[in-house]
C-alpha cells in the first residue's frame, strides 16, 4: 500500500512540476509594443501616442490587452515598465521650427474606477539642434517597478511627436509582471 | 494509515518546495557582460564589440554561453535584454577630429538557422563635443523584452568605439529570462 | 482507500499551488524609492543622496530595508537594479555657476563585512546649458543585473544635486529580485 502511494505521489508530483512551471512561467502577463509609424500625430506639445503594434515584428502581448492606444492590465501584480523613445531629424526633412527642443516622454497610468491620470516615469532632454549639422538624433530610456491593478491602463505621451523615429527598434514600450501583490 | 500518508505527504511536499524553488529560481538563464577594454576596435562607423568579460568583476553568466563576441541563448524563453554604453573624451585622450559625433548602440539578434541579423533595440544621440571643454561624457541605456530561441545570438554594435568608457560600471550589456514561451 | 488518498492528494496539491505561488511570487524582495525633495543636498561634486520615500506615492518596499539613505538587501539573490535621475534648471532659479555641467549618476554597492564601496553602474552626460535658453532638462537611466548578498547596501550618488528634478516620476531608483543564487 505504502509503496503504491509513493509511486502515485511521484507521478502526481512530476506532473505538479509541469503544472507549477506552466502556471508560474507561462501565465505571467507581458507586452512589448512598437510604434505604428503610419499614424504618428503632429505638433510640438505633449501628445498621447495611441498607435502601436502588438502583433508584428518585435511587438507582442500576452495576458494584457491593447485597446484605444492604451495597454490594459488584466492581472493585478507588480510589473516592470519600460519605454525607449527615439527622436531624429535630417536636413532633407525641412527646417525645424526651432533649434531649441524639449524632447520628452511620459509613461502614465490611468485608473478607470477613479478617472485620473498619473505620470509614473518621465525622461528626456532639452536639445539644441543647430543647422550646422545635417542629422540629429536622441534617445530616451526609462524603466521602473510599479504596482498595477486589473483595469488600469498604461499610455505614452511625448513632446514633438513628428520627430519620432518610426523604427520598431527605436520607439517602443513594454511591461512584464514580476510578482503578485501580497 | 491516513496519518502516515499525511506525514509522508508533508515530507515529500517539503522537498517539493525546495525542488520547485530550485528548478524555477536557479535554472533561469542570465548574463551580465562587461567591456574588455584591452580589445576595443577602432573605426567611426558601426562596429561590433566582440570582447566582453563574463567571469570577472560584475561580469557573470549562467545557462547562456558567450562565444565569438556573442551571447548565445541556450534556453527558449522571453528575456529582458539591456545595455548601458558610455562614451567619453578627455583632451589628453587624443586628437578628436570632429565635434559632431553620432554616439549610438545597436542590440542585434542573429539567428543561425536563417543567417540573418536584426536590430532589437537602438539608442544614442548626436553630440557636439566642443574644444571649449576639456572633458566630455555621454551614456546610453536601452532595454526591452524579447522572445529568444535556443541558438540565437545577441551582439552589440556601436559607433565610435574608440570613445568607449572602458570601466565595468560604464559599458556593459545583459539579459535575464523572465518566462517560458507558451 | 485509494480514492480517499487521491482526493486528499488533490486537496493538498491544490493548497500546494497557492503555497508555491505565494512562496515564489510574493516573497520576492523589491523596492522602488522616489526622491525626497525636502532634503536634497547642495554642491556640484559627487554626493550621496540619502533621503528617499519608500512608503508614499510610487515609493514601495518589500523584503528589503531602507535605512540611513541606503537600500539594504535582506535576501541573497540576483537582482535587477535601476535608476532614473532627472536634472533641470529654469532661469527663474537663478544663474548657473557654470554653463558646462557634468550630470552623472553612480549606483554603488557597499559591503558591511568588508567596508568597501563599489560602483555597479554609472551614466550621465556633460552638458552645455547656455543662457540662450530659459529652461534646461536632462534625464539619465541605468539598469543592470547583479548578485547581491544579505546585508549589502545600495546607494545613489549624483553630481550637481541642486539641479535634481524633485518629482517622484523623475528621480527614483529601485530593485527587484529575479532569481536565487545557485
Amino acid at each position: 500500500g505504502s509503496q503504491h502511494i509513493r509511486a502515485e505521489k511521484a507521478m502526481v508530483d512530476g506532473s505538479w512540476l509541469d503544472l507549477a512551471k506552466r502556471s508560474k512561467l507561462e501565465a505571467q502577463p507581458f507586452a512589448h509594443l512598437t510604434i505604428n509609424a503610419t499614424d504618428i500625430p503632429s505638433g510640438s506639445h505633449k501628445v498621447s501616442l495611441s498607435s502601436w503594434y502588438h502583433d508584428r515584428g518585435w511587438g507582442k502581448i500576452s495576458n494584457m490587452t491593447f485597446s484605444n492606444g492604451k495597454l490594459i492590465v488584466n492581472q493585478d501584480g507588480f510589473y516592470y515598465l519600460y519605454a525607449n523613445i527615439c527622436f531624429r531629424h535630417h536636413e532633407t526633412s525641412g527646417d525645424l521650427a526651432t533649434e531649441y527642443l524639449q524632447l520628452m516622454v511620459y509613461v502614465t497610468k490611468t485608473s478607470i474606477k477613479i478617472p485620473s491620470s498619473h505620470t509614473l516615469m518621465k525622461g528626456g532632454s532639452t536639445k539644441y539642434w543647430s543647422g550646422n549639422s545635417e542629422f540629429h538624433f536622441y534617445s530616451i530610456n526609462v524603466g521602473g517597478f510599479f504596482k498595477l491593478r486589473s483595469g488600469e491602463e498604461i499610455s505614452i505621451e511625448v513632446s514633438n511627436p513628428s520627430l519620432l523615429d518610426p523604427d520598431q527598434d527605436a520607439t517602443y514600450f513594454g511591461a512584464f509582471k514580476v510578482r503578485d501583490i501580497d | 494509515g491516513s496519518q502516515h500518508i499525511r506525514a509522508e505527504k508533508a515530507m515529500v511536499d517539503g522537498s517539493w518546495l525546495d525542488l520547485a524553488k530550485r528548478s524555477k529560481l536557479e535554472a533561469q538563464p542570465f548574463a551580465h557582460l562587461t567591456i574588455n577594454a584591452t580589445d576595443i576596435p577602432s573605426g567611426s562607423h558601426k562596429v561590433s564589440l566582440s570582447s566582453w568579460y563574463h567571469d570577472r568583476g560584475w561580469g557573470k553568466i549562467s545557462n547562456m554561453t558567450f562565444s565569438n563576441g556573442k551571447l548565445i541563448v541556450n534556453q527558449d524563453g522571453f528575456y529582458y535584454l539591456y545595455a548601458n554604453i558610455c562614451f567619453r573624451h578627455h583632451e589628453t585622450s587624443g586628437d578628436l577630429a570632429t565635434e559632431y559625433l553620432q554616439l549610438m548602440v545597436y542590440v542585434t539578434k542573429t539567428s543561425i538557422k536563417i543567417p540573418s541579423s536584426h536590430t532589437l533595440m537602438k539608442g544614442g544621440s548626436t553630440k557636439y563635443w566642443s574644444g571649449n571643454s576639456e572633458f566630455h561624457f555621454y551614456s546610453i541605456n536601452v532595454g526591452g523584452f524579447f522572445k529568444l530561441r535556443s541558438g540565437e545570438e545577441i551582439s552589440i554594435e556601436v559607433s565610435n568605439p574608440s570613445l568607449l568608457d572602458p570601466d565595468q560600471d560604464a559599458t556593459y550589456f545583459g539579459a535575464f529570462k523572465v518566462r517560458d514561451i507558451d | 482507500g485509494s480514492q480517499h488518498i487521491r482526493a486528499e492528494k488533490a486537496m493538498v496539491d491544490g493548497s500546494w499551488l497557492d503555497l508555491a505561488k505565494r512562496s515564489k511570487l510574493e516573497a520576492q524582495p523589491f523596492a522602488h524609492l522616489t526622491i525626497n525633495a525636502t532634503d536634497i543636498p547642495s554642491g556640484s561634486h559627487k554626493v550621496s543622496l540619502s533621503s528617499w520615500y519608500h512608503d508614499r506615492g510610487w515609493g514601495k518596499i518589500s523584503n528589503m530595508t531602507f535605512s540611513n539613505g541606503k537600500l539594504i538587501v535582506n535576501q541573497d539573490g540576483f537582482y535587477y537594479l535601476y535608476a532614473n535621475i532627472c536634472f533641470r534648471h529654469h532661469e527663474t532659479s537663478g544663474d548657473l555657476a557654470t554653463e558646462y555641467l557634468q550630470l552623472m549618476v553612480y549606483v554603488t554597492k557597499t559591503s558591511i563585512k568588508i567596508p568597501s564601496s563599489h560602483t555597479l553602474m554609472k551614466g550621465g552626460s556633460t552638458k552645455y546649458w547656455s543662457g540662450n535658453s530659459e529652461f534646461h532638462f536632462y534625464s539619465i537611466n541605468v539598469g543592470g543585473f547583479f548578485k547581491l548578498r544579505s546585508g549589502e547596501e545600495i546607494s545613489i550618488e549624483v553630481s550637481n544635486p541642486s539641479l535634481l528634478d524633485p518629482d517622484q516620476d523623475a528621480t527614483y531608483f529601485g530593485a527587484f529580485k529575479v532569481r536565487d543564487i545557485d
Epitope: - | 577602432s42 586628437d95 578628436l96 577630429a97 565635434e99 566642443s130 574644444g131 574608440s162 | -
Partner: antibody, heavy 122, light 107 residues
Framework: EVQLVESGGGLVKPGGSLRLSCAAS????????MSWVRQAPGKGLEWVAG????????YYPDTVKGRFTISRDNAKNSLYLQMNSLRAEDTAVYYC???????????????WGKGTTVTVSS | DIQMTQSPSSLSASVGDRVTITCKAS??????IAWYQQKPGKSPKLLIY???YRYTGVPSRFSGSGSGTDFTFTISSLQPEDLATYYC?????????FGGGTKVEIK
C-alpha cells in the same frame, strides 16, 4: 570635383610671418577635419597642424607649437595657417590635406592640394 | 613621438615584378598605418589605410598588411606608372608621423 587649392606662399626673412590659405570645393567642407603637411626640398613628409571639423580643436607637433596657428572658416570653405617666427628649417612645400573619415582619433589624408612653396631665407 | 622607419630607401625593379616595401614603427600602432604614393612633382595620393584597406579607386595590385610594429606594402605586378616615392604614415597617435619614403624606379 573635390579640390584643395593652396595660396599665400613666398619668400620671407627668418623671424618673419606668412599666412597660407586653402580654398576647398566639391565637398561639404564643414564635415571634415583638415591638416597642413609640409615637405622640405628633397625630403619626406611632415605633419605640421590639424584642426577639427568645427574648428574648436587645434593640434600641432612640438616643432611648430606656439609659432603656427591653424584656423578655418566653414562659411567660406577655407583653411588657414598663420606662421610666425619663421626659421630656415620651415622652408618647404606646404600642402593642405583633408582628413579621411575614420576613427575619430586617427588622422590620415585622402585629398591633397598641389602645395604652395614657403622659402625662409635672409 | 612614434618613429617610422621605412626600407629600402630606394629600389629598382622591372615591369611585372612584385615589389615589397616595409615600415617599422617604434611602438605598437595596432593596424593604424596608411601608405601614400607621390609621383615626381605631384602631391601625395592615399593608397592604403588601416594597414590593409585599399582607398576608393586604387588598383588591386596595391596591397598592405601587418599589425603592431611591422608593416608591408606590396605592388603585385609593377607597372610603368608606378614610378614614384611611397610613404608610410602611422595614424595611431598624434603627432602623425611619416616614414622617410621609398623611391621606386623602373629598370
Amino acid at each position: 570635383e573635390v579640390q584643395l587649392v593652396e595660396s599665400g606662399g613666398g619668400l620671407v626673412k627668418p623671424g618673419g610671418s606668412l599666412r597660407l590659405s586653402c580654398a576647398a570645393s566639391g565637398f561639404t567642407f564643414r564635415n571634415y577635419a583638415m591638416s597642413w603637411v609640409r615637405q622640405a626640398p628633397g625630403k619626406g613628409l611632415e605633419w605640421v597642424a590639424g584642426i577639427s571639423s568645427g574648428g574648436t580643436y587645434t593640434y600641432y607637433p612640438d616643432t611648430v607649437k606656439g609659432r603656427f596657428t591653424i584656423s578655418r572658416d566653414n562659411a567660406k570653405n577655407s583653411l588657414y595657417l598663420q606662421m610666425n617666427s619663421l626659421r630656415a628649417e620651415d622652408t618647404a612645400v606646404y600642402y593642405c590635406a583633408r582628413r579621411d573619415y575614420g576613427d575619430v582619433y586617427e588622422w590620415y589624408f585622402d585629398v591633397w592640394g598641389k602645395g604652395t612653396t614657403v622659402t625662409v631665407s635672409s | 613621438d612614434i618613429q617610422m622607419t621605412q626600407s629600402p630607401s630606394s629600389l629598382s625593379a622591372s615591369v611585372g615584378d612584385r615589389v615589397t616595401i616595409t615600415c617599422k614603427a617604434s611602438q605598437d600602432v595596432r593596424t593604424s598605418i596608411a601608405w601614400y604614393q607621390q609621383k615626381p612633382g605631384k602631391s601625395p595620393k592615399l593608397l592604403i589605410y588601416s594597414a590593409s584597406y585599399r582607398y576608393t579607386g586604387v588598383p588591386s595590385r596595391f596591397s598592405g598588411s601587418g599589425s603592431g610594429t611591422d608593416f608591408t606594402f606590396t605592388i603585385s605586378s609593377l607597372q610603368p606608372e608606378d614610378l614614384a616615392t611611397y610613404y608610410c604614415q602611422q595614424h595611431y597617435s598624434s603627432p602623425w608621423t611619416f616614414g622617410g619614403g621609398t623611391k621606386v624606379e623602373i629598370k
